[in-house]
């Protein structure tokens, strides 16, 4: 159930075609989870500042049941910062990503939970 959320001040017209499926594919590969369980949410046009500057920036979160941890998170950061830099032109030093290891019982889906 990996869920990746990107809040950014980049305008929606700067989000390139195919960005959502690209995120989905890359996250599926990185987490080892099937693409059909990956959810991505890109929220553009936000009023944001990072370090006092309104240059392009992003505040992100990655929720997953397992597959979260020190080494894995470093790998995700490299992947996701790379995509945000390449596709949205956001410098990696203007990106925060919070990682959440979810308890299966606390994630609802399809009338139930993953527990």
């Amino acid at each position: 159930m990996p869920m990746f959320i990107v809040n950014t001040n980049v305008p929606r017209a700067s989000v390139p075609d195919g960005f959502l499926s690209e995120l989905t594919q890359q996250l599926a590969q990185a987490t080892g989870k099937p693409p059909q369980y990956i959810a991505v949410h890109v929220v553009p046009d936000q009023l944001m500042a990072f370090g006092g500057s309104s240059e392009p920036c992003a505040l992100c979160s990655l929720h997953s049941i397992g597959k979260i941890g020190g080494a894995q998170n470093r790998s995700y950061s490299k992947l996701l910062c790379g995509l945000l830099a390449e596709r949205l032109r956001i410098s990696p030093d203007r990106v925060y990503i919070n990682y959440y290891d979810m308890n299966a019982a606390n994630v609802g889906w399809n009338n139930s939970t993953f527990a």
């Epitope: 929606r12 017209a13 390139p16 075609d17 195919g18 499926s21 059909q36 949205l88 032109r89």
Partner: antibody, heavy 123, light 107 residues
């Protein structure tokens, strides 16, 4: 009404370059990624690549790297594709295309197409 | 790259008949598929997107179906204006490849 108006047919010599234009109307070019396609008898339709005008971000088909260069002139609402080192294999109809009016960031179903530009490479 | 295998390459049918054109992807494309119609000397026109959704202005006799690697375009009660070429195209990662096309001719 969204329209993509392409430049006219080109007859060019092998080894030369050609630049095809795609002038947009009915919307501002910076709002949407612009894509280019090649259609030849041998290879059906092929996606060459797309350019997001706001940022200049390119998404391309590795097969056409070194062959096609995509650019945008925001002031004139025009997208360009330059093809270089032309050979007979580059003889084809080239199209610019754009997705529909919603689904930012999603798969670019091509709802709007230019009328096509015929490029003929011949000595 | 994902390969799109379209069949048949051509078919000859009569007005009023129903036809099915199929497209097979070399891997799961998760319904990221479009169908286009192209008349001789004209640009392609979007018929179906996301495998099953009809584009604006497309008659209801057209219908897209499928999932995973197998997709179909059905045309019910063929009309004279339906003759031409049809192409599928996937959007599950670049390059976005097209099928080889199906030429629909009047019998």
């Amino acid at each position: 009404e969204v329209q993509l108006q392409q430049s006219g047919p080109e007859l060019v010599k092998p080894g030369a370059s050609v630049r095809i234009s795609c002038k947009t109307s009915g919307y501002t070019i910076t709002e949407y990624t612009m894509h280019w396609m090649k259609q030849s008898h041998e290879k059906s339709l092929e996606w060459i690549g797309g350019i997001t005008p706001n940022t200049g971000v390119l998404s391309d088909n590795q097969k056409f790297r070194g062959k096609a260069t995509l650019t945008v002139d925001k002031s004139s609402n025009t997208a360009y594709m330059e093809l270089r080192s032309l050979t007979s294999a580059d003889s084809a109809v080239y199209y610019c295309a754009r997705r529909g009016n919603n689904y930012y960031g999603s798969s670019p179903w091509f709802a709007y197409w230019g009328q096509g530009t015929l490029v003929t490479v011949s000595a | 790259d994902i390969q799109m295998t379209q069949s048949p390459a051509s078919l000859s049918v009569s007005v009023g008949e129903t036809v099915t054109i199929t497209c097979r992807a070399s891997e799961n494309i998760y319904s990221n598929l479009a169908w286009y119609q192209q008349k001789q000397g004209k640009s392609p026109q979007l018929l179906v997107y996301a495998a099953t959704n009809l584009a604006d202005g497309v008659p209801s006799r057209f219908s897209g179906s499928g999932s995973g690697t197998q997709y179909s375009l059905n045309i019910y009660s063929l009309q004279p204006e339906d003759f031409g070429s049809y192409y599928c195209q996937h959007f599950w990662g670049t390059p976005y490849t097209f099928g080889g096309g199906t030429k629909l001719e009047i019998k």
